[in-house]
Interface confidence: low
């Protein structure tokens, strides 16, 4: 027999056994030109010493073979003795190590068997009623196709599915969408209405994320507030990466999960913008304010679940960086100014009412005054901080008040509002004999002591009523007792106590009159 013809003789080996796991498979035959044809197949197993024979049986029952040696591809013409206009059955027999292995058969009409291309170029992926819809342009001159898909997850093997017949310039397929795992899809096509004809190769992988983006399991830490009044938010634990099927493990577009950080500044609600969204990679600097932080995961199908944290306000307070002067017209605050044209947000809230909304005021952009101070004033009629109670005051600054991440804390401190002098006056002053020449004086703590850092000291004044001599004794703000020594028996004394702040001298308590009795010896 000539090599270019199909040999109508018995092949030079014994009968084939198709029961082996190895051997030839995936035979496909198709027309490649007006009179030229090609068959190709895969061979599974060791290839050394393997000879392949392409077998063909005509509708008449006559059979022939092509010997291809070690090649797994054969081209022949319509003159090779194989009928191209009628149905033929083809298969491959591979002879090796004194045994023959046979491929599955294909039955087709060679002339009508055109090699179809898989979907090429951009395959559009969308979600439709809980399913996955893939759409692509039909390859040139190949309208009319049957389409199959196969899909797998990171933990499963390929599963085959059918897209049904296609007969248009664009083709589409509805496929199952997994809720929580990524999938890899491939598509293939063959000519519509020619059951025995060969399938195209599989398309490039189409990588599809789960319907639900994963819960963003991350952890944050917040650094301490720096001297510039800002603290860095850092990511302690990156989001876990989505497990991907084998064909999607390179830079696979389509399965990416993007994480965004949504920042909501809770303090200073009167500022222009309270919320900002930024990429998770771009960790921001924050002021010392309280924030809610959400990490939002999203994929090509939209946003997924988010995880929310509360970042408490930095409670570190400055030692008296704020000066408050109360005059007849009203009250003015002074503090060390930031750069030119800075907007300040002054926020205050009664201590113990942290759940309620703070009072908030935004200044116009202001420059430092000649003393390098910034100011904020209000009238007595406004009633601001007018009650006798402790207020927590925080001042924030920004040169760009509309940019949420550019706010910084200027200071955080406490202030006792209203008539602090009267409200802070110590009460319940008592005097007890301590020894022959000393007494113990104690009093109820001043209301000012409820306000952290506000009470600077107590002062105890003792006046000798005989000589009008006065002595003053400073007492730590945490103490409410002092011993007065070197007193003379029989002399009348008055004692008073006052509570002072850094900027305000308190009012004296009611005078307590006492004397040490003279000891009479027997």
């Amino acid at each position: 027999c000539r090599t270019s013809e199909c040999c109508f003789q018995d092949p030079p080996y014994s009968d084939a056994d198709s029961g082996s796991a190895s051997g030839p498979r995936d035979l496909s035959c198709y027309r490649i030109s007006s009179a030229g044809y090609e068959c190709s197949w895969q061979y599974e197993g060791p290839t050394a010493g393997v000879s392949h024979f392409l077998r063909c049986c005509l509708s008449s029952g006559r059979c022939c073979y092509f010997a291809t040696g070690s090649a797994t591809r054969l081209q022949f013409s319509d003159q090779a003795g194989v009928s191209v206009l009628h149905t033929v059955t083809l298969w491959v027999e591979s002879w090796a190590r004194n045994r023959t292995e046979k491929s599955p058969e294909v039955t087709l009409q060679l002339y009508k068997s055109v090699k179809y291309k898989p979907p090429l170029g951009d395959i559009k992926v969308s979600k439709l009623a809980g399913q996955l819809r893939m759409e692509w342009e039909t390859p040139d001159n190949q309208v009319g196709a049957e389409v199959q898909f196969r899909h797998r997850t990171p933990s499963s093997s390929w599963k085959l599915g059918d897209c049904g017949p296609q007969d248009d310039d664009t083709e589409s397929c509805l496929c199952p969408l997994e809720m929580n795992v990524a999938q890899e899809f491939q598509l293939r096509r063959r000519r519509l209405g020619s059951q025995g004809s060969s399938w195209s190769k599989w398309s490039s992988p189409v990588c599809v994320p789960p319907e639900n983006p994963p819960q963003p399991q991350v952890r944050f830490s917040v650094e301490q507030l720096g001297r510039d009044g800002r603290r860095r938010l850092t990511l302690k634990e990156q989001p876990t990466q989505l497990e991907l099927p084998e064909g999607c493990q390179g830079p696979a577009p389509g399965v990416e999960v993007t994480y965004q950080l949504q920042l909501h500044m809770l303090s200073c609600p009167c500022k222009a913008k309270a919320t900002r969204t930024l990429p998770l990679e771009k960790m921001p600097y924050l002021s010392g304010a309280a924030y809610n932080v959400a990490v939002i995961s999203s994929n090509r199908f939209g946003p997924g679940p988010n995880q929310t944290w509360h970042i408490p306000a930095d409670t570190h307070t400055e030692p008296v960086a704020l000066n408050i002067s109360v005059g007849t017209n009203g009250t003015t605050m002074y503090w060390p100014a930031r750069a030119q044209s800075t907007t300040y947000c002054i926020e205050w809230q009664p201590v113990g009412q942290e759940g309620s909304l703070a009072t908030c005021n935004l200044t116009a952009p202001q420059d430092p005054d000649p003393a390098g101070m910034a100011t904020y004033s209000w009238s007595r009629e406004s009633g601001a901080m007018g009650q006798e109670k402790c207020y927590h005051i925080t001042i924030f600054a920004s040169a760009h008040p509309k940019k949420l991440t550019l706010w910084s804390t200027v200071l955080s401190t406490y202030h006792f509002g209203g008539n602090a002098s009267a409200a802070g006056t110590p009460h319940h002053v008592s005097v007890k004999n301590h020894s022959l020449d000393s007494v113990s004086v104690d009093w109820a703590p001043s209301l000012l002591s409820t306000c952290p850092g506000v009470l600077k000291e107590y002062v105890v004044r003792c006046r000798d009523e005989d000589s009008n001599q006065v002595s003053e004794h400073p007492v730590q703000p945490t103490e409410t007792q002092v011993t007065l020594s070197d007193l003379r028996a029989g002399v009348a004394y008055t004692v008073q106590v006052r509570a002072d702040t850094a900027w305000l001298r308190g009012a004296w308590s009611q005078p307590q009159r006492f004397s040490i009795k003279v000891q009479v010896s027997d």
Partner: antibody, heavy 119, light 110 residues
Framework: QVQLVESGGGVVQPGRSLRLSCAAS????????MHWVRQAPGKGLEWVAI????????YYADSVKGRFTISRDNSKNTLYLQMNSLRAEDTAVYYC????????????WGQGTMVTVSS | QSVLTQPPSVSAAPGQTVTISCSGS????????VSWYQQLPGTAPKLLIY???KRPSGIPDRFSGSKSGTSATLGITGLQTGDEADYYC???????????FGGGTKLTVL
Amino acid sequence: QVQLVESGGGVVQPGRSLRLSCAASGFTFSSHGMHWVRQAPGKGLEWVAIIWYAGNKKYYADSVKGRFTISRDNSKNTLYLQMNSLRAEDTAVYYCARESLLNSASDIWGQGTMVTVSS
Amino acid sequence: QSVLTQPPSVSAAPGQTVTISCSGSSSNIGNNYVSWYQQLPGTAPKLLIYDNNKRPSGIPDRFSGSKSGTSATLGITGLQTGDEADYYCGTWDSSLSAVVFGGGTKLTVL
């Protein structure tokens, strides 16, 4: 609305095991730490265990350490308590409770499920 | 024996004020926020006070909480018959790495 529903209670012999479940709805379950708290008949509340939102950290009361395991399945919005080597003193109503996002208080409680350990 | 100590019972007439104490140590109440829970007969506990003195929405301002050192106090003013319940304090214990509760206080409205 925000709800926690416990199930899995019943009568069990000493030394045997039981698994309690707590189904959460109406809130983002995976953002909250979750507790199990129990109450023996006529007695006060006794904390049993806590699990952090991601399931990566757990703490137990000394009385159940080594016998009970707290776990969660965030995809099913469910909290579990696996109770092994049960004793008569484990007889109680078992409540699951949600830890608030913004403070450490248990702000939502289930209605409880009764576990009776008796031979 | 509970880690936090509460009086077993308190009673008062309607309209009166009552306080329930809860004492612990520096590792629990001293270091951490205290919560208070109300358990009406036959029902699950309900959060009454958190962070020592804050009320969740829906809790009337008749209920108040305070903390001083290693002790906390629950105050109820204008007592109503519907306030009859068991009240528990709870907090985190930094040494035990555990949540600890008081033994509970039964409030009777006479």
